[in-house]
Interface confidence: low
């Protein structure tokens, strides 16, 4: 169900051990309760308990305190689960009965007699705070408290929002009190299924399949995938886009491996002669008077 109406019975007082018809119980009123929860009615009528009903075992004789009990027979608070949007209003009928029969299943015994009943009608918001109340009639007094809480994984003012925290293939989040998703660290997106990549990871050139990762797309490298990878055979060049080979100054050719500045790189001309570049690996030495040879070495 999406929520639970909880009713905590606290104390029942029937000092004279009387039934609603004025007769007395012999030897005492062995008391159990029938609870009927239904939609709000201006005038409470007989008919189905539309929000649920529950009966207790015998809880005591005449006057008694009802202890909290978490499980098994005689559980207190009583649990009335529902599987719909909590409307915020309700009608509650609590009947005290005497049984001459079985303690654990008094509901099935013949000869049960009504001791008293109370009807509560009104509004009740979902919340953890117990609303405490006490009802008296001429013969009996009942102290009790009640509340409506959402079941596990249900949230919101009417327990209508279902949210299951998860950390798996399809989402990584916890649930906020209103049922909205709160992504676990490192995840984003409507369903928290998109990892947040390493800070600074290039938006176009990098991606990630888990948080704080930066995987480079083809043609890019570096921790943040912001460095392009030049052409495979690029010798003396760089790139601004992948597989490019933009030659450094003085170099040419497809792979930037052809020396366009042989004079500077190799100083082939001797004895103060002048060196002139003339294409890849090409150069000419102009000799000073008195020198000769290809490199003015003679």
């Amino acid at each position: 169900g999406s929520g639970i109406f909880q009713l905590r019975l606290q104390e029942f007082v029937n000092q004279r051990g009387m039934l609603a018809n004025g007769q007395s119980c012999e030897p005492g009123c062995r008391t159990f309760f029938r609870i009927c929860l239904k939609h709000f009615q201006a005038t409470f009528s007989e008919g189905p308990c539309t929000f649920g009903n529950v009966s207790t075992p015998v809880l005591g004789t005449n006057s008694f305190v009802v202890r909290d009990k978490n499980s098994g027979s005689g559980r207190n608070p009583l649990q009335l689960p529902f599987n719909f949007t909590w409307p915020g209003t309700f009608s509650l009928n609590i009947q005290a009965w005497h049984t001459p029969g079985d303690d654990l299943r008094p509901e099935t015994s013949p000869g049960n007699s009504l001791i008293s009943q109370i009807i509560i009608q009104g509004s009740l918001a979902v919340g953890k705070i117990w609303r405490t109340d006490e009802q008296n009639d001429t013969l009996t007094r009942l102290s009790y408290s009640y509340r409506v809480i959402c079941s596990d994984n249900y949230y919101g003012e009417s327990c209508s929002r279902l949210c299951k925290k998860r950390d798996d293939h399809f989402g990584h989040y916890e649930c906020q009190p209103d049922g909205s998703l709160s992504c676990l660290p490192g995840w984003t997106g409507k369903y928290c299924d998109q990892p947040i990549c390493l800070s600074g990871c290039h938006e176009q050139n990098g991606y990630c399949s888990k948080p704080d990762e930066c995987i480079c797309r083809p043609g890019w490298q570096g921790r943040l995938c912001n460095e392009c990878i030049p052409h495979n055979g690029c010798r003396h060049g760089t790139c601004s886009i992948p597989w490019q080979c933009a030659c450094d100054e003085g170099w040419g050719g497809l792979f930037c491996d052809q020396d366009l500045n042989y004079c500077t790189h190799h100083s082939p001309c001797k004895n103060g002669s002048t060196c002139s570049n003339s294409g890849p690996k090409g150069y000419t030495c102009t000799c000073l008077p008195g020198y000769t040879g290809e490199h003015c070495e003679l």
């Epitope: 919101g156 209508s160 929002r161 997106g189 369903y191």
Partner: nanobody, 126 residues
């Protein structure tokens, strides 16, 4: 209600390929995760591959690089391309659709309903 119909299973030799299809009908939206699981004899059902809300794909380590999941939103169909099949891939393959239904007043509130197909047998012989 959602109905799933798988197809494409069969007998194939090790190293071969198969393509599984799963057509979904009913209340399917784009905010729906779809995936494939498998169950070998005597073993528990295990996750194989999934494709999430934003078309993000996920794979079990044992099938990474060999299997590819994809989906056609217009046809409400999810596919599993299985290459380089191994004998240990032999199993009944189940299509799964996890419908995320927005609940009243929910900003990102979702209810999870997982629907399973009937399964299709894949047998890889050595």
């Amino acid at each position: 209600q959602v109905q799933l119909q798988e197809s494409g299973g069969g007998l194939v030799q090790a190293g071969g390929s198969l393509r599984l299809s799963c057509a979904a009908s009913g209340n399917i939206s784009t905010g729906t995760a779809m995936g494939w699981y498998r169950q070998a004899p005597g073993k528990e059902r295990e996750f194989v591959a999934g494709i999430a809300y934003g078309a993000t794909t996920y794979y079990a380590d044992s099938v990474k690089g060999r299997f590819t999941i994809s989906r056609d939103n217009a046809k409400n169909t999810v596919y599993l391309q299985m290459n380089s099949l191994k004998p240990e891939d032999t199993a009944v393959y189940y299509c799964a659709v996890e419908v995320s239904q927005s609940t009243p007043g929910g900003r990102y509130s979702v209810a999870y309903l997982i629907y399973w197909g009937q399964g299709t047998q894949v047998t890889v012989s050595s």
